[in-house]
């Protein structure tokens, strides 16, 4: 019973975690414009792994995809790769763990096979979670480095002609979603690995003992039958998260109700 609960909980936690990793990967707010020196701005910039966006005071939001592949920073490419690897591993892990669930009957699959599949999915979840945490951490480190390199009054020349105030970026919501999701996936993976130990068939020290009754010869083998918990009948696969689709107006940049500028 405890094993089934641990396995089921591990699966659910991992499912939520992977949904979160997918959401974080799709989110546009990996980095947001630092508003420390200018808390009220008419143009607000934020960036994701796939596109950068600008939200104007008017409410108009414009997003532009990073259509170049070679022109992007290597670190950004690495973060993308880590997140995608995390999603792929997590998705495969989820698929494997569905069949590994003790409450789901698939033919005459033995407990040893389920134990192996649980361990495999657990390891996949752990690696998936680590990939997400690593990806988000690499991006966060990149932001911190860039933040201190660019100061509020630092100007960068555009072709020696135009001077633009450098926009500083700070941590966006996606980073926190990614960290939490990666952590959940990792925890779910550990739970699956713990559940695997309980699923593995135990070696029995009992020898088979024959009892001879008159007229019939019946052999009783203690430990030969395992009781199974019947959770299978009402188990449903619920959709935990819906694809990471977001509206542009979901996050409001207004710092306060009344601002004087």
């Amino acid at each position: 019973m405890a094993v089934t609960a641990c396995q089921g909980l591990g699966f659910v936690v991992s499912l939520i975690g992977i949904a979160g990793i997918i959401a974080a990967t799709c989110m546009d707010q990996w980095s947001t414009q630092d508003l420390y020196n200018n808390p009220v701005t008419a143009v607000f910039n934020y960036q994701g792994l796939w596109r950068s966006c600008v939200r104007e005071s008017s409410g108009f939001t414009e997003c532009r995809g990073y259509f170049t592949l070679l022109g992007l920073p290597a670190m950004l490419q690495a973060v993308r790769a880590l997140m995608i690897v995390g999603i792929v591993l997590g998705a495969i892990g989820l698929l494997v763990s569905i069949f590994a669930l003790k409450c789901i009957r698939i033919g005459s699959m033995e407990d040893s096979a389920k134990a192996n599949m649980t361990l495999t999915s657990g390891i996949m979840f752990i690696v998936s979670g680590l990939c997400a945490i690593a990806g988000v951490s690499v991006f966060a480190n990149m932001l911190v480095t860039n933040f201190w390199m660019s100061t509020a009054n630092m100007y960068t020349g555009m072709g020696g002609m135009v001077q633009t105030v450098q926009t500083r970026y700070t941590f966006g919501a996606a980073l926190f979603v990614g960290w939490v999701a990666g952590g959940l996936t990792l925890i779910g993976g550990v739970m699956m690995c713990i559940a695997c130990r309980g699923l593995a068939p135990e070696e029995t020290n009992y020898k088979a003992v024959s009892y001879h009754a008159s007229g019939h010869s019946v052999a009783y083998k203690p430990g030969g039958f395992k009781a199974s918990t019947g959770f299978g009948s009402n188990t449903k696969n619920k959709k935990i998260y819906d694809g990471g689709a977001r509206t542009e107006d979901e996050v409001q940049s207004y710092p306060s109700k009344h601002d004087y500028v």
Epitope: E56, S58, G59, R64, V162, Y254, S256, V261
Partner: antibody, heavy 118, light 113 residues
Framework: QVQLVQSGAEVKKPGASVKVSCKAS????????INWVRQATGQGLEWIGE????????YYSEKFRGRVTLTADTSISTAYMELSSLRSEDTAVYYC???????????WDQGTTVTVSS | DIVMTQSPSSLAVSAGEMVTMNCKSS????????????LTWYQQKPGQPPKLLIY???TRESGVPDRFSGSGSGTDFTLTISSVQAEDLAVYYC?????????FGQGTKLERK
């Protein structure tokens, strides 16, 4: 057809308050930000502030801090600009305008003339 | 606050002439996020409210004749009227739409020569 219609001309005494209304039609009122701009006779344009009707968020020019209050009544699609402690230099035409793409004001009303005189 | 300075303060022109007026901002209006310049041009005729001509420094508002064009980046901007018509005689204002408070230039008056 987007339209902004302001209240009529006002004559006020120094120290009094004036409340100018701006009724919007032809679009969803909460979709666009409303800006207020004034223009003294023969002078240039001066930005007063803006209100986001959806959340009621307001941003004011430092010059009018504490004297101006922008409000919006979404039920009747009307924005209001109240200016208190009036002085003679507040005599001007007050415009409301819709802020659109590029933070540009692309729909203006005909303006309300406010005269401050003792 | 961003200070907007327009030059010249007035221009005397004849119909069909090409006209350019300048606008300078005390800070860059170029947003690095989308590489757009947040500068807006308005036209105001006597007794009328201002009319939007150009936003993002060079994007013409729909319905504005193509003889009007905007250019420039960062801190220096220009409004050009390729062939002035009688109905173009008005005051032209540039505006910072990048940072609060939104600030306007003092205007350039276009008059008949």
């Amino acid at each position: 057809q987007v339209q902004l219609v302001q209240s009529g001309a006002e004559v006020k005494k120094p120290g009094a308050s004036v409340k100018v209304s701006c009724k919007a039609s032809g679009y969803t009122f909460t979709s666009y930000v409303i800006n207020w701009v004034r223009q003294a006779t023969g002078q240039g344009l001066e930005w007063i502030g803006e209100i986001h009707p959806r959340g009621g968020n307001t941003y004011y020019s430092e010059k009018f801090r504490g004297r101006v209050t922008l409000t919006a009544d979404t039920s009747i699609s009307t924005a209001y600009m109240e200016l208190s402690s009036l002085r003679s230099e507040d005599t001007a035409v007050y415009y409301c305008a819709i802020l659109r793409r590029g933070n540009a004001m692309d729909y203006w009303d005909q303006g309300t003339t406010v005269t401050v005189s003792s | 606050d961003i200070v907007m300075t327009q030059s010249p303060s007035s221009l005397a022109v004849s119909a069909g002439e090409m006209v350019t007026m300048n606008c300078k901002s005390s800070q860059s209006l170029l947003n690095s996020g989308n590489q757009r310049n947040y500068l807006t041009w308005y036209q105001q005729k006597p007794g009328q409210p201002p009319k939007l001509l150009i936003y993002w420094a060079s994007t013409r508002e729909s319905g504005v004749p193509d003889r009007f064009s905007g250019s420039g980046s960062g801190t220096d901007f220009t409004l050009t009227i390729s062939s002035v018509q009688a109905e173009d005689l008005a005051v032209y204002y540039c505006q910072n739409s990048y940072n609060y408070p939104y600030t306007f230039g003092q205007g350039t008056k276009l008059e008949r020569k």
